[in-house]
């Protein structure tokens, strides 16, 4: 039932732009006067009962253009993809030649999106058609969830519980706000 199943328009990967580009630092914006005080959603730590660093979930970056029908984003965009299996961080193969994958005995854990964010995208269209403005859904961060017998998104169970949180919101990663940098995200990568 997750949004990944929603229709996703074609995208093209641009490897020559760098495999893991860093988003630009956040610029000043004029929204602060309406912001909730302490309005950021606190970071999600699904393993709070243990050492937070004990488990890891890989986040990969890709650069690509986003399309909507015949229209294509004016600039390539950078997106985050949750990848791989969850396990103790010390055993995840983050470097070439590093050992084997950790496989839990018992329930299976999967790296899936935790939070989402929006990015403005201006789409240029052929044939003199007017440009389009859209906001694309991006993965902001990943987390580990436990797979139950049923493997659809809605059945993924959290590691631990989350209490009520005041003022929804979190700046998941710095990004240019007023520059309106365009970003998009991969479907079915999880």
């Amino acid at each position: 039932q997750g949004w990944q199943a929603f229709k996703n328009d074609a995208t093209e990967i641009i490897p020559e732009l760098g495999e893991y580009p860093e988003p630009p630092p956040e610029l000043e914006n004029n929204k602060t006067m309406n912001r909730a005080e302490n309005g950021g959603r606190p970071p999600h730590h699904p393993f709070e009962t243990k050492d937070v660093s004990e488990y890891s979930c890989r986040e990969l970056h890709f650069t690509r253009y986003v399309t909507d029908g015949p229209c294509r984003s004016a600039k390539p965009v950078t997106e985050l993809v949750c990848s791989g299996q969850c396990g103790p961080a010390r055993l995840l193969p983050n470097a070439i030649g590093r050992g084997k994958w950790w496989r839990p005995s018992g329930p299976d854990f999967r790296c899936i999106p935790d939070r989402y964010r929006a990015q403005r995208v201006q789409l240029l269209c052929p044939g003199g058609e007017a440009p389009r403005a859209r906001k694309v859904r991006l993965v902001a961060s990943c987390k580990c969830k436990r797979l139950t017998r049923f493997h659809n998104q809605s059945e993924l169970k959290d590691f631990g519980t989350e209490a009520a949180r005041p003022q929804k919101g979190r700046k998941p990663r710095p990004r240019a706000r007023s520059a309106k940098a365009n970003q998009a995200e991969l479907e079915n990568a999880y």
């Epitope: 997750g2 949004w3 229709k7 929204k31 950021g40 964010r117 929006a118 403005a133 906001k135 979190r170």
Partner: antibody, heavy 121, light 110 residues
């Protein structure tokens, strides 16, 4: 599909506070951007505030700044809107609305049934 | 805070065409205001017809279309039906802060 179910009607006295809930089903709250809109009897729609996924923050309409608090409980997928220092002109139907959790953000796609809040002494 | 203006009321004949507009006190409405259009009938919650200037939804009848027209957002109804009689609201995005227009009461004379 996203579905929103709101709490029942409330009658409050001036100066009191009201907390309206909005239960999300079909998706998890963390996948969605919840906004709150109100409509006084015979009047138009008025945006109160909501989650801006572009900046990852809750943003409130200036008119309600300091008087409204929007929170969430992700363990129950329920969003809340609390309005304090109520006055008679706050009598309205309060709606929660959310995006469709699609590839493109489209806000206000799904609406709760509305909660009538009556402020009367 | 910006003020969003709409025609208070408009009338159209069945089968006719009518255009509702949505202006901003801050200047011309552009695609970067991501204009939305909503339809609301008495006793019902609003429902979205158009998002992001011109993007229809699965439930939006084909006779509705969104555009920009002379510095305003526009909702055009071509081939009006009796069931289109309703209140129509536009909504503009001012960098994450939203403002509704005052609404247009559309009457379908029949």
């Amino acid at each position: 599909e996203v579905q929103l179910v709101q709490s029942g009607a409330e009658v409050k006295k001036p100066g009191a506070s009201v907390k309206v809930s909005c239960k999300v089903s079909g998706y998890t709250l963390s996948e969605l951007s919840i906004h709150w809109v109100r409509q006084a009897p015979g009047k138009g729609l008025e945006w109160m505030g909501g989650f801006d996924p572009e900046d990852g923050e809750t943003i409130y309409a200036q008119k309600f700044q300091g008087r409204v608090t929007m929170t969430e409980d992700t363990s129950t997928d329920t969003a809340y809107m609390e309005l304090s220092s109520l006055r008679s002109e706050d009598t309205a139907v309060y709606y929660c609305a959310t995006d469709s959790a699609g590839y493109w953000y489209k806000f206000f796609q799904h609406w709760g049934q509305g909660t009538l809040v009556t402020v009367s002494s | 805070q910006a003020v969003v203006t709409q025609e208070p009321s408009l009338t159209v004949s069945p089968g006719g065409t009518v255009t509702l507009t949505c202006g901003s006190s801050t200047g011309a409405v552009t695609i970067d205001h991501y204009p939305y259009w909503f339809q609301q009938k008495p006793g019902q919650a609003p429902r979205t017809l158009i998002s992001d200037t011109d993007d229809k939804h699965s439930w939006t009848p084909a006779r509705f279309s969104g555009s920009l027209l002379g510095g305003k957002a526009a909702l055009t109804l071509s081939g009006a039906q009796p069931e289109d009689e309703a209140e129509y609201y536009c909504l503009l995005d001012y960098g994450g802060s939203f403002v509704f227009g005052g609404g247009t009461k559309l009457t379908v004379l029949g």
